[in-house]
């Protein structure tokens, strides 16, 4: 008996062929006997089956004696024997039906987990391996299950059902909600605008949720609110926002705050946070203001950061063109009596300047 | 050119036959299918059957099973339609029609002219 | 038996007016199986499309046919005097072979 595995949905094309290369009468049954489909002349005829109006066939094979059975937008239950009766022969196809469907939404959060189903027809026996687009690899029976989702799982998997050495194909989009980064840092001079960019790691038609950006100063003994909004049709609105700093917020994706202007005290770490309706957890994204100041007070220059520096930035002052006078792996440094000229505050991470300061020291006569 | 040219009117009395002729030219006659169709006055089009004039095999609807009867005469490129125990409800235009089979599609593409049968008593 | 079933009965429009012609059929049937016809008062009907889709030998391209499943439908861009006739859909899914009940489109 020969096997055909078809996916829930789907279209099916159970072949029938006859010795004799012309239009002859033929007739398809399930294994209750009951009529599907069969010919009279040029024309379908169909029987009390359930498949009544998801039945047909291919009229323009007929006269090479080609009589198909077509199944469309498969069911499970549509699992059975099959069978072509023409030229007084039979015909026999076990036609089995998958289907494979992620048991919550396939727009998911980052870090929750992906459970895919497998609905099979009773008595079989199948196995399922499924690759992410990352080329994971998970196998499974009835269930397969992904915990802790990364946005390199989103995209395109690839599942793979084998029953009775056929196998059977499933792509199944997934989507994983996420930030495009985790983790942000913004380097700024004291008095600079500041842009953080808070963009989205996919595309959905419709995204309506609602945010907050958490603020840690360095200096402050407690994090603060510093802004809450609402996201509608991906149209952002501000609900509340703090007297200082007085963030902007732009009205279009992605998600764009403007601090007017850096300044040691907002110096510091911050958490924006977006739920999104209909979705149980949120998005995060962390982002790190690093502020520096570059000073002259009488004999004293004084260069300094505030915010979140790793141990390995070097913090330098050099007059320009010239060799640094002082470097160090701290959050200040300073030069006494310094020459006149322009003086550069530099911080760099090997080499490479992520900040710079200039300020004038002037002649002293 | 292609033409399926029908016997004249006929007037019949309820329980009388009436056979309608079909004369088709221009084509190979064993072919094509012959459909046959009727119309009452004012009414819509209702299928009766087919024939294939190659094999002679022929298929109608269960409402006319029993009183139609369609046949062919090849030599002559004739089909024939006869309907017996004639009631009033009869009374119609009588159409043949060429089915063309043409991959999956059928379609009626040549009419003849349609022959008036009037059942009265 | 697939019913078919046409709306609206009439349809009176003037020439230069889209004329839009809809066939609902009792249960799904393939775009492959429905076919349009013409009808004159005293005339044999006359095939437009076949396939749902396809327009016929010499059939003006004022007339489209669209739908798939269920509802089908027959477009007249821009009504001309000589498309003032009956309009009749056709199923040929599967035996018997019915026709909807028959669209009359008139002048207004």
């Known amino acids: 008996k020969k096997v055909v595995l078809g996916k829930k949905g789907d279209t099916v094309e159970l072949t029938c062929t006859a010795s004799q290369k012309k239009s002859i009468q033929f007739h398809w049954k399930n294994s209750n006997q009951i009529k599907i489909l069969g010919n009279q002349g040029s024309f379908l005829t169909k029987g009390p089956s359930k498949l009544n109006d998801r039945a047909d066939s291919r009229r323009s094979l007929w006269d090479q004696g080609n009589f198909p059975l077509i199944i469309k937008n498969l069911k499970i239950e549509d699992s059975d024997t099959y069978i072509c009766e023409v030229e007084d022969q039979k015909e026999e196809v076990q036609l089995l039906v998958f289907g494979l469907t992620a048991n919550s939404d396939t727009h998911l959060l980052q870090g929750q987990s992906l459970t895919l189903t497998l609905e099979s027809p009773p008595g079989s026996s199948p196995s399922v391996q499924c690759r992410s687009p990352r080329g994971k690899n998970i196998q499974g029976g009835k269930t397969l299950s992904v915990s802790q989702l990364e946005l390199q799982d989103s995209g395109t998997w690839t599942c793979t059902v084998l029953q009775n050495q056929k196998k059977v194909e499933f792509k199944i989009d997934i989507v994983v909600l996420a930030f495009q980064k985790a983790s942000s840092i913004v380097y700024k001079k004291e008095g600079e605008q500041v842009e953080f960019s808070f963009p989205l790691a996919f595309t959905v038609e419709k995204l309506t949720g609602s945010g907050e950006l958490w603020w840690q100063a360095e200096r402050a003994s407690s994090s603060k609110s510093w802004i809450t909004f609402d996201l509608k049709n991906k149209e952002v609105s501000v609900k509340r926002v703090t007297q200082d700093p007085k963030l902007q917020m732009g009205k279009k994706l992605p998600l764009h705050l403007t601090l007017p202007q850096a300044l040691p005290q907002y110096a510091g770490s911050g958490n924006l946070t977006l739920a999104l309706e209909a979705k149980t957890g949120k998005l995060h994204q962390e982002v790190n203001l690093v502020v520096m100041r570059a000073t002259q007070l009488q004999k004293n220059l004084t260069c300094e950061v505030w915010g979140p520096t790793s141990p390995k930035l070097m913090l330098s002052l050099k007059l320009e063109n010239k060799e640094a006078k002082v470097s160090k792996r701290e959050k200040a440094v300073w030069v006494l009596n310094p020459e006149a000229g322009m003086w550069q505050c530099l911080l760099s991470d090997s080499g490479q300047v992520l900040l710079e300061s200039n300020i004038k020291v002037l002649p002293t006569w | 050119q292609v033409q399926l040219v029908q016997s004249g009117a006929e007037v019949k009395k309820p329980g009388a036959s009436v056979k309608v002729s079909c004369k088709a030219s221009g084509y190979t006659f064993t072919s094509y299918d012959i459909n046959w169709v009727r119309q009452a006055t004012g009414q819509g089009l209702e299928w009766m059957g087919w024939m294939n004039p190659n094999s002679g095999n022929t298929g109608s609807t269960q409402k006319f099973q029993g009183r139609v009867t369609m046949t062919r005469n090849t030599s002559i490129t004739t089909a024939y339609m006869e309907l017996s125990s004639l009631r009033s409800e009869d009374t119609a235009v009588y159409y043949c029609a060429r089915g063309v089979l043409k991959g999956d599609y059928y379609y009626m593409d040549v009419w003849g002219k349609g022959t008036t049968v009037t059942v009265s008593s | 038996e697939i019913v078919m079933t046409q709306s609206p009965a009439t349809l009176s429009l003037s020439p230069g007016e889209r004329a839009t012609l809809s066939c609902r059929a009792s249960q799904s049937i393939s775009s492959s199986y429905l076919s349009w016809y013409q009808q004159k008062p005293g005339q044999a009907p006359r095939l437009l499309i076949y396939?749902?889709?396809t327009r016929a030998t010499g059939i003006p391209a004022r007339f489209s046919g669209s739908g798939s499943g269920t509802d089908f439908t027959l477009t007249i861009s821009s009504l001309q005097p000589e498309d003032f006739a009956v309009y009749y859909c056709?199923?040929?899914?599967?035996?018997?072979?019915?026709f909807g009940g028959g669209t009359k489109v008139e002048i207004k």
């Open positions: 396939g749902s889709s």
């Open positions: 056709q199923q040929d899914d599967h035996l018997p072979l019915t």
